[in-house]
């Protein structure tokens, strides 16, 4: 129950041993009590004891004092438990009875007789203090006291507030007299179920499951979770925010694993060679004459420098070398010729010019060939033109440098910032922070590299028509429809077919005239360009060694808008007609000028959705036909092409889908 009405019987006096009817008890009044507790009544009436009733065993004969007894029969005070909110008022009827029968259960005996009764009506507040009273009539006197207390775990003025002290997963508290919770030390909250963390524990980065604890969230460490943890791959770096890798002094690279002072720390170069802190391993050895090898550890043969000219063969001798000259040549290095132009000495289409009144000659070699007789194929890579560990490649009449990650430029001489590697997915903005890239993610994405999508799927509603494939965009409500052949529009809702009343003849004539005009302009421009072009190597290499195929496949820079000067894309599909597929999903942070490429490869035929023009969105390029070749060349210093990737297609029927 929620509370207990307690009645303590103290003394009963019936000196003459009389019953209520005036008769006397023989041999004396063996007295027990019946107690009835009910709701307040102005006039006490018979009827059920609504708040409870209780009987005692025989407590004495005639007059007696009632002792307190806590257990068993004859318990005193008497307990009347109730299971409701105590109303504050009551009616109490106490009756004294005489029984001739059993002492322990007298209320069941026949022949019981009433000795006296008292009725108490009034108000009584819950409390521990006993209210004492005494009732007299002509024959008897009863002394007693009573009170109402709350049962265990019940509190408040009416015992209506339940509170059970606990110290477990659901709470850590004791109960105050009014029933409110009093948290145990180290706990807080409405139900005292929240631990008070270690003093100073960082509010966002730390938490606790028990008092005076400070457990760090991922990316944080230390007693108060106020120190970040560097990136997993970081080697010689620290952080100011989690997963960063800001290099210690003397270290570089994305994971601070490149020793910027390798030469000083390790002295790797042998035999008096010069060490420089560059190259793929963090150092490069420049050997003295007569030595070779990565660390200049190998001695060269005297013939290693190829001293014999005109096809002469070299033989090593103890301290020098000897050239065996082919027919028609003589001299220490076979440098003198006995031939003339009449002997047709120039190979590979070289033209012969007579010198010294016909006693000697000189060969003028076509591109790609060299040597006094044009007998050697040009290797433009012999001079090691590629810096920073770039790989030199002979490509027809020119050479190109294939740069290591982190470098660019004609000779790989330019260092790209870490952000140029585009570490941020989904259009995240990259910031270079002390050698470590940090991504600021757009709405709807999170994670160190913005790789985690945290919003609902904009494609879930199926916004694309005509069997188009839907891709979610950058912001939560963005989506992109990739239309099947024959449909266009931001939702692929428009078929490509033209209206029936289309004036075909007029349009055909108009288009024909426009095409003729364009061809005429192109011829004029081509002729002018040919006149302006210098034939020497320098001008040929000025465009970052573009192959002819690549030069033919450039979109004028005016049609592209560069919004991120750091971003570069290198796509090399090779010179064969291979299927480039999705171009490795390289994402450019550029805005595509409206109408650059509609579907079907016709610039500006169908306008893009207005929504896509004003905001940064990823542009993914992929060939939809295996015959298509997409070339893309970037040069950050090439002002002619405005530091953007110029992309084009080989054939008109090839389609480059632009998902914007």
């Amino acid at each position: 129950g929620s509370g207990i009405f307690q009645l303590r019987l103290q003394e009963f006096v019936n000196q003459r041993g009389m019953l209520a009817n005036g008769q006397s008890c023989e041999p004396g009044c063996r007295t027990f009590f019946r107690i009835c507790l009910k709701h307040f009544q102005a006039t006490f009436s018979e009827g059920p004891c609504t708040f409870g009733n209780v009987s005692t065993p025989v407590l004495g004969t005639n007059s007696f004092v009632v002792r307190d007894k806590n257990s068993g029969s004859g318990r005193n005070p008497l307990q009347l438990p109730f299971n409701f909110t105590w109303p504050g008022t009551f009616s109490l009827n106490i009756q004294a009875w005489h029984t001739p029968g059993d002492d322990l259960r007298p209320e069941t005996s026949p022949g019981n007789s009433l000795i006296s009764q008292i009725i108490i009506q009034g108000s009584l507040a819950v409390g521990k203090i006993w209210r004492t009273d005494e009732q007299n009539d002509t024959l008897t006197r009863l002394s007693y006291s009573y009170r109402v207390i709350c049962s265990d775990n019940y509190y408040g003025e009416s015992c209506s507030r339940l509170c059970k002290k606990r110290d477990d997963h659901f709470g850590h508290y004791e109960c105050q007299p009014d029933g409110s919770l009093s948290c145990l030390p180290g706990w807080t909250g409405k139900y005292c179920d929240q631990p008070i963390c270690l003093s100073g524990c960082h509010e966002q980065n730390g938490y606790c499951s028990k008092p005076d604890e400070c457990i760090c969230r991922p990316g944080w460490q230390g007693r108060l979770c106020n120190e970040c943890i560097p990136h997993n791959g970081c080697r010689h770096g620290t952080c100011s925010i989690p997963w960063q890798c800001a290099c210690d002094e003397g270290w570089g690279g994305l994971f601070c694993d490149q020793d910027l002072n390798y030469c000083t720390h390790h002295s790797p170069c042998k035999n008096g060679s010069t060490c420089s802190n560059s190259g793929p391993k963090g150092y490069t050895c420049t050997c003295l004459p007569g030595y070779t090898g990565e660390h200049c550890e190998l001695g060269l043969s005297k013939c290693a420098s190829n001293p014999c000219r005109n096809g002469g063969s070299c033989k090593d001798q103890e301290n020098s070398y000897h050239c065996l000259c082919p027919p028609g040549y003589y001299g220490q290095h076979c440098e003198h010729s006995t031939l003339t132009c009449a002997d047709s000495p120039c190979f590979n289409g070289g033209s012969c010019r007579e010198r010294n009144q016909g006693s000697s000659y000189a060969c003028e070699c076509p591109p790609n060939f060299t040597g006094s007789n044009c007998e050697k194929k040009v290797d433009r890579c012999t001079s090691n033109p590629c810096a920073n560990g770039g790989q030199c490649q002979n490509r027809g009449p020119s050479r190109t440098c294939r740069c290591r990650p982190g470098f660019t430029g004609t000779h790989c001489e330019l260092h790209i910032s870490d952000c140029a590697r585009s570490p941020c997915a989904h259009g995240g903005t990259c910031h270079d922070l002390e050698n470590g890239p940090v991504c600021t993610c757009p709405a709807g994405f999170s994670g160190r590299r913005c790789e985690v999508r945290i919003t609902h799927d904009a494609c879930a509603s199926g916004p694309c028509f005509n069997g188009a494939t839907c891709y979610t965009g950058l912001s939560p409500n963005n989506f992109v429809c990739n239309c099947p052949y024959g449909f266009v529009g931001s939702r692929c809702e428009f078929p490509v077919g033209l209206p029936p009343s289309f004036p075909w003849v007029a349009v055909s004539l108009g288009v024909g005239l426009v095409v003729l005009l364009v061809l005429l302009v192109m011829v004029v421009v081509a002729v002018r360009q040919l006149r302006l072009r210098r034939p020497d190597d320098e001008s040929r290499e000025a465009m970052n060694n573009l192959s002819d195929f690549q030069k033919d496949n450039l979109i004028p820079a005016a049609q592209l808008k560069n919004t991120n000067q750091k971003k570069e894309l290198e796509v090399d599909c090779g010179l064969d007609k291979s299927n480039c597929g999705k171009l490795q999903n390289h994402t450019l942070d550029y805005n595509l000028a409206p109408g650059l490429l509609g579907r079907g490869g016709m610039p500006g035929k169908y306008p893009h959705s207005d929504k896509s023009l004003g905001e940064k969105v990823p542009l993914r390029l992929h060939s939809e036909k295996p015959e298509c070749r997409i070339s893309a060349i970037c040069s950050p210093r090439d002002s002619m092409y405005q530091s953007v990737c110029l992309i084009s297609e080989e054939r008109n029927e090839c389609v480059i889908a632009t998902e914007v």
């Epitope: 457990i215 230390g222 007693r223 080697r235 010689h236 210690d248 985690v452």
Partner: antibody, heavy 118, light 107 residues
Framework: EVQLVESGGGLVQPGGSLRLSCAAS????????MAWVRQAPGKGLEWVAT????????YYRDSVKGRFTISRDNAKNSLYLQMNSLRAEDTAVYYC???????????WGQGTLVTVSS | DIQMTQSPSSLSASVGDRVTITCRAS??????LAWYQQKPGKAPKLLIF???ILADGVPSRFSGSGSGTDFTLTISSLQPEDFATYFC?????????FGQGTKLEIK
């Protein structure tokens, strides 16, 4: 190249003590939190203890609390695990690893075997 | 403690096969999950962290996905050197806990 080399393992009687060491190289040791992870023979992996990089805050799994102590000496690029009151269930290969209790373990040593048996 | 349950416990496959291993957490661990590869007598090697980020030097045939309680490790085309035991690990709650492992064997 990151290298973590454990030592100090061996056979010990129940109730005995052992001190494991881990020598680190190839990275700036003082910048990174470190941990011990163990693997009972033929069983899975179990995190044992962690120590932060700068203030040396330590955390332990409940079953080793009060018996094991993790510590570090940044000047010596070394991590330690003092194991007291050893029990048979502590028998395992003990790995030194770079990481915290709330991060992946990026680099691991080759491990050292601790056998607790009478 | 968070329980990590891997399935299957063992798996036979051939070179070139596509293989998927799953890992289930007893509570939501957000994206704080890593995958390790362990060869007999060797230390584990970190493959993937934060559910889907490849660790330095790990081949791109390995990929991870999932969030919350269900995660997968996929090897797109098995190579001979990929036969090993794979473990998942959560680091969202203390203590960090590992899966029991999936042994990948040659068929």
């Amino acid at each position: 190249e990151v290298q973590l080399v454990e030592s100090g393992g061996g056979l010990v009687q129940p109730g005995g003590s052992l001190r494991l060491s881990c020598a680190a190289s190839g990275f700036t040791f003082s910048n990174f939190p470190m941990a011990w992870v163990r693997q009972a023979p033929g069983k899975g992996l179990e995190w044992v203890a962690t120590i932060s990089s700068s203030d040396g805050t330590t955390y332990y799994r409940d079953s080793v609390k009060g018996r094991f102590t993790i510590s570090r000496d940044n000047a010596k690029n070394s991590l330690y695990l003092q194991m007291n009151s050893l029990r048979a269930e502590d028998t395992a290969v003990y790995y030194c690893a770079r990481g915290y209790y709330n991060s992946p373990f990026a680099y691991w040593g080759q491990g050292t075997l601790v056998t607790v048996s009478s | 403690d968070i329980q990590m349950t891997q399935s299957p416990s063992s798996l036979s496959a051939s070179v070139g096969d596509r293989v998927t291993i799953t890992c289930r957490a007893s509570q939501d661990i957000y994206y704080n999950l890593a995958w390790y590869q362990q060869k007999p007598g060797k230390a584990p090697k970190l493959l993937i962290f934060d559910t889907n980020i490849l660790a330095d030097g790990v081949p791109s045939r390995f990929s991870g996905s999932g969030s919350g309680t269900d995660f997968t490790l996929t090897i797109s085309s098995l190579q001979p050197e990929d036969f090993a035991t794979y473990f998942c690990q959560q680091y969202d709650y203390v203590p960090p806990t590992f899966g029991q492992g999936t042994k990948l064997e040659i068929k």
